[in-house]
């Protein structure tokens, strides 16, 4: 299953299978997840140790037990691959990282006025993977403000140094956020030059485009067919670059297909697994396993539940079959793409879903009436659970927020449907930022259920908590994915990083905003809150938030929208915005339901019709 | 020039066998993996069975499992289809259609169709 | 099995119009999307190959998108020879099921 926790003070000891430098312990984990071997990473931050060469350190390990033995080392930091994590897999790491220079190949030098400008510039930038801003105080007068744009052969830094007054960070080109667009057509019967990146084995060319796509140096492939003339090279996926991010020349080739990365594509990337199934054809590989089931779907769940499993081979031979079982193969190679395709076999073939990000239709949890007053305009991708609950009916009007946990679930405050209990009324907007974009084109979802908690009164703050099942599950994507759910009565979390998102009023007697805001609020004590609030009763079920001299808060508008806190580098939902006195007034904190204390009712509401628990563990 | 051509459709009594013939010229037949598709007359397409490259690996839509069988012969270059125990809702155009290479399998070269009645 | 859902189910055009068709699958199917045409008495033709792929000798004005589940044909100016019914089809896994079909008619 999925494992999210994260081990401070501890270094896996042996199984390495690659190691690079990275920023932080959140890259290594990322770099660790899309990786085809690693289940385990550690991390050495440039605190933990004083050998230059292993500062920032990420050490990516193999183990047949999916465990290894952990030593003592202060400060390093040690987790598991996010395979198997659902939609908490992804490519997209937005962090800056202030007094670090990431080093590369420096391909292209310009003066920016702040590190987000040198950021977008990476972003917009075919090869750019990573960037170093030199700030307006850095000690050299003539390198302040330069934006230096970065490659390596591995994606990742060749070295990283603690300098003062550099903040650098990683290409948003896959959180879909580039402004290049891509290239979707594939063209038949046509070959492109120039220098192969790496070479891999695939079945078909939509699996040669993924495997580019998430690769670090790949812009565009080759693929040669089962018919290709050459024996050997029948299968091949060349994945390529050149110097000037586009094929030099392409020749007109029969049995071959061409195509380009859809890294630089905006607000939609390929999933980074193959989901396919191909009938008749024998995927060969190292073997992990060799189980007897019924039926090819079967076996390619078993693929992904067993985490070193790559690919799989279902067997119809009469000789691999007893009763209505036969033998699924369970293999593995380096690369994690077969080392051998045979056509014309009875077998099915097809890879393991450890990395897709769709999940199954679940709500996300992990183990371990109000606009934003004081905030700033959000970016594309930032808060991918926030949904717009709109109601329609001569005119439509945004009324309240709410999070996305699930493929079909939005949790929200029970006062939004105040008045207004009818389904049909409403539309669900996910995966957008400005409300301006909404026209009559834009697809919404539609409401099959309101649960409103059984205890929630109108006019009373208690139990402010419903639960929406959308007619039709939501496909996830780097704008549009759930939120996950703190554990059940959670109190021993201390969270020091929130926000709260929404469109809602920015002053008490304001207007609905068009541009997502957000705005980081500290928690509040329920004792403090208490205080604050003497006419009403704070309950345990409640959490407050806000600055003891106000000025930023939730308003109208942002009810029912997330409070969610980051602790070891994942969001969880902490508040749903419920109520508190005007907005961003003085000693006035805003108060959330608490989630946590609702666990329960969430899970027993969110169950299928046929009992099983719609709940998606990632610990 | 790429071409499939089906032959083999007619008239027959519910219960009755026909066997469909699928001669394709033109592009390398052993290497490709074939299907059946059909079209009931005003109808949409059905997908009716496919068949891997060598012959070795067959599937079938339920609504013909255990009637129809799907075979080939690559020395022929020629893709069949054996019906039996024909009923009234397998009137229809029967095609004959080769998948793509690489491409996902989509069908991609497909024969004019015959005929197929099945009636009393 | 996985259903696949066109839509509208017919619609009225004339020559030089962007014509847009849906198709929706009852699960995600990834990119193995396809779009065939086809014209009365004849077979279909293949038009779009993995939702956005286009077939070899087919015009550019046809074009495909989208993914998992939802799905867009769009003939950007539509011409005298592409009145015909539009088939959506998946390759995702058997049973490889069409929608029921889109007849595209002159108004």
């Known amino acids: 299953g999925c494992l999210t926790q994260l081990y401070e003070n501890a270094f896996f000891r042996g199984g390495d299978v690659a190691s690079m430098y990275t920023p932080n312990a959140q890259y290594c984990q990322m770099r660790c997840t899309f990786h085809p071997r690693c289940l385990l990473f550690s991390f050495l931050p440039a605190s933990s140790i004083n050998d230059m060469e292993k500062r920032f350190g990420c050490f990516l390990k193999d183990s047949v037990t999916g465990t290894l033995p952990k030593v003592h080392r202060t400060g390093a930091v040690s987790g598991h691959s996010l395979k198997q994590c659902g939609h908490q897999i992804s490519a997209c790491h937005r962090d800056i990282y202030k007094g670090v220079d990431m080093r590369g190949v420096n391909f292209n030098v310009s003066k920016v006025s702040s590190v987000e400008e040198c950021q977008k510039r990476c972003t917009s930038n075919i090869r750019c993977q990573f960037f170093s801003y030199a700030t307006q105080t850095f000690h050299k007068a003539e390198y302040r403000n330069n934006c230096l744009l970065k490659y390596s052969p591995g994606g990742t830094p060749t070295a990283i140094k603690v300098l003062s007054n550099v903040e650098s960070g990683f290409s948003l080109k896959p959180c879909a956020l580039s402004e290049i667009g891509c290239h979707m057509n594939i063209f038949q019967h046509l070959a492109f030059s120039d220098v192969d990146v790496a070479r891999v084995l695939t079945p078909d060319a939509f699996v040669c485009r993924t495997i580019c796509t998430y690769h670090p140096n790949c812009l565009f492939f080759t693929f040669y067919t089962n018919v290709w003339k050459i024996e050997s090279q029948r299968n091949v996926c060349l994945l390529k670059t050149s110097e000037s991010g586009t094929p030099s020349s392409s020749t007109p080739q029969e049995n071959t297909i061409s195509g380009y990365s859809l890294l630089t594509c905006k607000r939609t990337l390929p999933e980074p697994c193959h989901s396919k199934i191909y009938p008749g054809v024998d995927f060969g590989g190292e073997e992990l396993n060799v189980t007897f089931v019924k039926g090819v779907n079967v076996c390619q769940e078993t693929c992904t539940k067993m985490i070193r499993c790559q690919f799989f081979t279902y067997s119809l031979l009469p000789e691999d079959c007893k009763e209505e079982k036969c033998k699924c193969f369970l293999r593995l190679s380096m690369d994690g793409s077969p080392t051998r395709i045979a056509y014309g076999t009875q077998g099915s073939s097809g890879y393991s879903l450890r990395l897709c990000n769709t999940g199954d239709n679940s709500v996300c949890t992990t183990k371990t009436s109000t606009r934003i007053v004081g905030g700033t305009n959000s970016s594309w991708g930032e808060w991918p659970w926030q949904v717009s609950l709109q109601v329609k009916l001569t005119a439509q009007r945004h009324l309240c927020g709410g999070s996305l946990i699930g493929h079909q679930w939005v949790l929200t405050a029970a006062h939004c449907f105040d008045g207004l209990p009818l389904q049909d009324v409403w539309r669900i907007y996910s995966g957008i930022l400005n409300l301006s974009d909404i026209t009559k084109d834009t697809p919404f979802s539609q409401i099959k259920e309101i649960i409103i908690h059984q205890n929630y009164k109108v006019s009373e703050g208690n139990h402010d908590i419903a639960l929406i099942k959308l007619q039709a599950p939501l496909n996830y994507t780097e704008f549009q994915k759930p939120i996950c759910l703190p554990s059940k009565g959670d109190t021993s979390t201390i969270y020091t990083n929130c926000w709260v998102t929404g469109w809602g009023f920015s002053k008490e007697k304001g207007e609905i905003q068009n541009i997502l805001q957000k705005v980081n609020i500290p928690l509040v004590t329920n004792e403090e809150c208490q205080k604050r609030y003497q006419d009403y009763k704070i309950t345990q079920r409640m959490v407050c938030a806000g600055y003891k001299e106000g000025g930023k808060d939730a308003c109208k508008g942002d009810s029912g929208g997330p409070l969610v806190c980051k602790h070891n580098g994942m969001w969880r939902l902490v508040g749903i915005t419920s109520w508190g006195e005007g907005c961003a007034r003085r000693e006035q904190p805003g108060v959330y339901t608490k989630v946590a204390e609702y666990m329960d009712w969430i899970l027993e509401k969110t169950q299928s019709s046929d009992g099983k628990a719609q709940m998606q563990s990632p610990a | 020039e790429v071409q499939l051509l089906e032959s083999g459709g007619g008239l027959v009594q519910p219960g009755g066998s026909l066997r469909l013939s699928c001669a394709a010229s033109?592009?390398?037949?052993?290497?490709?993996?074939m299907v059946w598709v059909r079209q009931a007359p005003g109808k949409g397409l059905e997908w009716v069975s496919s068949?891997?490259?060598?012959?070795?690996?067959?599937l079938y839509a339920d609504s013909v499992k255990g009637r129809f069988t799907i075979s080939r012969d690559n020395s022929k270059n020629t893709l069949y289809l054996q019906m039996n125990s024909l009923r009234a809702e397998d009137t229809a155009v029967y095609y004959c259609?080769?998948?793509?290479?690489?491409?996902?399998?989509?069908?991609?070269?497909w024969g004019q169709g015959t005929m197929v009645t099945v009636s009393s | 099995d996985i259903q696949m859902t066109q839509s509208p189910s017919s619609l009225s055009a004339s020559v030089g119009d962007r014509v847009t068709i849906t198709c929706r699958a009852s699960?995600?199917?990834?990119?193995?999307l396809n779009w065939y045409h086809q014209k009365p008495g004849k077979a279909p033709n293949l038009l779009i190959y993995?939702?956005?792929s286009l077939q070899s000798g087919v015009p550019s004005r046809f074009s495909g998108s989208g993914s998992g589940t939802d799905f867009t044909l769009t003939i950007s100016s539509l011409q005298p020879g592409d009145f015909a019914t539009y088939y959506c089809?998946?390759?995702?896994?058997?049973?490889?099921?069409f929608g029921g079909g889109t007849k595209v008619e002159i108004k």
């Open positions: 068949i891997g490259s060598s012959g070795g690996f067959t």
């Open positions: 993995g939702a956005s």
């Open positions: 089809q998946h390759s995702y896994s058997t049973p490889f099921t």
């Open positions: 259609a080769s998948m793509n290479l690489g491409g996902g399998d989509a069908f991609d070269i």
């Open positions: 699960q995600s199917i990834g990119i193995y």
């Open positions: 033109g592009f390398t037949f052993s290497s490709y993996a």
